[in-house]
Interface confidence: low
């Protein structure tokens, strides 16, 4: 169980000529509202196919009236999040459809008129519990900026919200801040509560209270770009004033990057991150325009077509850099559950799962009990992909179909006699012993050395094993 959340940041005319000035028709004022629709999988589904994962409608936004001389603004939006609850597992791969609707408030016969203004569709992979993903999409002449995430609710955890954590009254074996999970009681799940102030953009945590930095960032809260940190270089003598190692001469000294490029060290060399409009080893080549297709990974290029005009790349979630060319090593976030091996193939993230686990992030423990019944009151035990029945007393075999003699294993200690019984076995203990298996010696004073006999049972009485 969980909820998908969508936050619309802005909706307005896209850049460039021919952008509309107003969402309203000439008939008068209007207001906007949004509809979100979620469909499972990444396939291109027909627009009219049902929103199988759910749908939600926003409130109406404030009334907008076009002001002829004013520049076209970002339009007034409805407040709050759009939330789509999901009851079952989060699928990980889904299609997100966002529709912008216009409600005309002029003198309409029969009340307000609705019309679809823009529709964007994104096919995405998204793990539940991850950070907000930001996106910018064009729909015709309109531009929509939004963020979204999926999060688990109630006691669900995991990237698919499929594992249930149950609160315990007993002290946790897992240490402070960790909670035991069912059904794998030995596996502990840390709620993702990072150190206070840890950068949402450049930091992450695997244990409560920590703040680990993504590549290129440093500092206790991952707010310092690595290239500016005085403690980053590990060459040279230690500085008594800073407590850091003072960097010695390095490949970036004297900044080999031209045209305002920033230099970062690579093993034995350097790399220039170039500003818009420049590229090359040292940012020495200029004259790039949108016509050159400089925005990678689905980035949206905005800018003029003439050689002197710079451009801006609006990057999709997960990419950064002047040209959306850089992506954080997504495997550093350890997205593969249950010991799965993470492979970042650049164009996709893949988890190679251990035996007994499946799913995009190895989040599903393959339940070999599905469709398998254990006979005669036995219960199916799931574990690592293997099907095993825990049989009721008196039965055995793979599916508990074979009758078993409960006395065959000689369960009664110290010479006690075993009797098969409809609900199990009974031990008749030899003098001087007691217990369900005759395991406790009785002292001469008639008091057992271990737990006292339950009321109504004297030492030596046959005891039924429940």
């Amino acid at each position: 169980a969980g909820v998908f959340e969508l936050q619309i940041h802005s909706f307005g005319p896209g850049p460039g000529p021919g952008a509309p000035r107003s969402p309203c028709s000439a008939r008068g004022p209007c207001r906007l509202f949004f509809r979100v629709c979620l469909k499972p999988g990444l396939s291109e589904e027909a627009a009219e196919s049902p929103c199988a994962l759910g749908a939600a409608l926003s409130a109406r936004g404030p009334v907008y009236t076009e002001q002829p001389e004013a520049p076209a603004p970002d339009l007034p939006l409805p407040n709050g999040l759009l939330q789509v609850p999901f009851r079952d597992a989060w699928p990980g791969t889904f299609s997100l459809i966002i529709e912008t609707w216009r409600e005309e408030l002029g003198d309409q016969i029969g009340g307000p008129a609705w019309s679809l203004l823009a529709r964007v569709t994104r096919r995405r992979r998204l793990a539940a519990g991850g950070p907000w993903a930001r996106d910018i999409q064009r729909a015709g002449a309109w531009e929509l900026r939004f963020s979204y995430r999926a999060r688990c609710e109630l006691l669900a955890v995991g990237t698919a919200c499929t594992r249930l954590c149950r609160p315990r009254s007993a002290p946790s074996r897992c240490g402070p801040g960790l909670r035991p999970c069912a059904p794998l009681e030995d596996e502990c799940e840390a709620p993702p509560v990072c150190r206070a102030g840890c950068s949402l953009e450049h930091g992450f945590c695997e244990q409560p209270g920590e703040c680990r930095c993504l590549e290129g960032w440093t500092g206790p809260l991952c707010t310092v770009p690595a290239s500016t940190s005085s403690c980053l270089g590990l060459r040279g003598p230690s500085s008594a004033t800073t407590g850091c190692l003072v960097p010695g001469p390095g490949p970036c000294d004297g900044n080999p990057c031209a045209n305002g490029g920033s230099c970062s060290e690579t093993p034995g060399s350097f790399e220039c991150t170039c500003p818009r409009g420049f590229y090359g080893l040292r940012c020495e080549v200029s004259g790039v325009t949108c016509a050159d297709g400089p925005c990678f990974n689905g980035g949206l290029c905005v800018g003029g077509a003439d050689p002197d005009s710079a451009y801006i790349c609006h990057c999709p979630p997960g990419f950064q850099g002047s040209n959306c060319e850089k992506r954080v090593d997504r495997c550093s976030l350890q997205p593969c559950r249950n010991g799965g091996l993470c492979l970042d193939l650049g164009h996709a993230l893949r988890c190679r799962c251990r035996a007994g686990f499946a799913g995009p992030r190895c989040e599903h423990n393959l339940d070999d009990c599905a469709g398998r019944a254990c006979a005669n009151g036995g219960t199916c035990v799931e574990g690592g992909g293997a099907h095993r029945c825990s049989c009721a007393l008196g039965f055995g075999g793979r599916d508990c179909r074979e009758r078993a003699d409960p006395c065959a294993a000689r369960p009664c200690a110290h010479g006690g006699r075993c009797y098969a019984h409809f609900s199990g076995l009974v031990c008749a203990c030899a003098p001087g012993y007691m217990g369900s298996r005759c395991e406790f010696p009785v002292h001469p004073d008639g008091v057992s050395a271990l737990p006292a006999a339950p009321p109504g049972l004297r030492p030596g009485d046959p005891q039924r094993y429940l």
């Epitope: 093993p267 790399e271 080549v285 297709g293 990974n297 650049g346």
Partner: nanobody
Framework: QVQLAESGGGSVQAGGSLRLSCVAS???????????MAWFRQAPGKEREGVAA????????SYADSVKDRFTISKDYANNTLYLHINNLKPEDTAMYYC????????????????????WGQGTQVTVSS
């Protein structure tokens, strides 16, 4: 530091085919997609020329006019390997073939320019006899 190692060259009759490979090491697999890569060749006594390139990020490909429809460049992200499939070889394809890489992106229209590439392999010889 990125190291590039080419293989797959050899002697072949005109009209034959070859597949050249270039393995990139010393660069994290997770960021291999950020390398723009290309194949260049140099025949004895001639200038080095770019024959095919594939840019980072989008994987846009570019080819020299002399090899269009005969050469195909591709990149195997899982194995950090660049390939050049050569069909219908001609004697004028005889040259030393070099693999080159640059960190980040290179505009496709300029991706066959040698001085934009930082990392170079040692080369593999292709000889085509008529």
């Amino acid at each position: 530091q990125v190291q590039l190692a080419e293989s797959g060259g050899g002697s072949v009759q005109a009209g034959g085919s070859l597949r050249l490979s270039c393995v990139a090491s010393g660069y994290p697999s997770s960021t291999y997609y950020m390398l723009s890569m290309a194949w260049f060749r140099q025949a004895p006594g001639k200038e080095r020329e770019g024959v095919a390139a594939i840019t980072s990020g989008t994987g846009s490909t570019s080819y020299a006019d002399s090899v269009k429809d005969r050469f195909t460049i591709s990149k195997d992200y899982a194995n950090n390997t660049l390939y050049l499939h050569i069909n219908n070889l001609k004697p004028e394809d005889t040259a030393m073939y070099y693999c080159a890489a640059a960190s980040g992106w290179i505009v496709p229209s300029r991706s066959l320019t040698a001085n934009l590439y930082r990392y170079w392999g040692q080369g593999t010889q292709v000889t085509v006899s008529s």
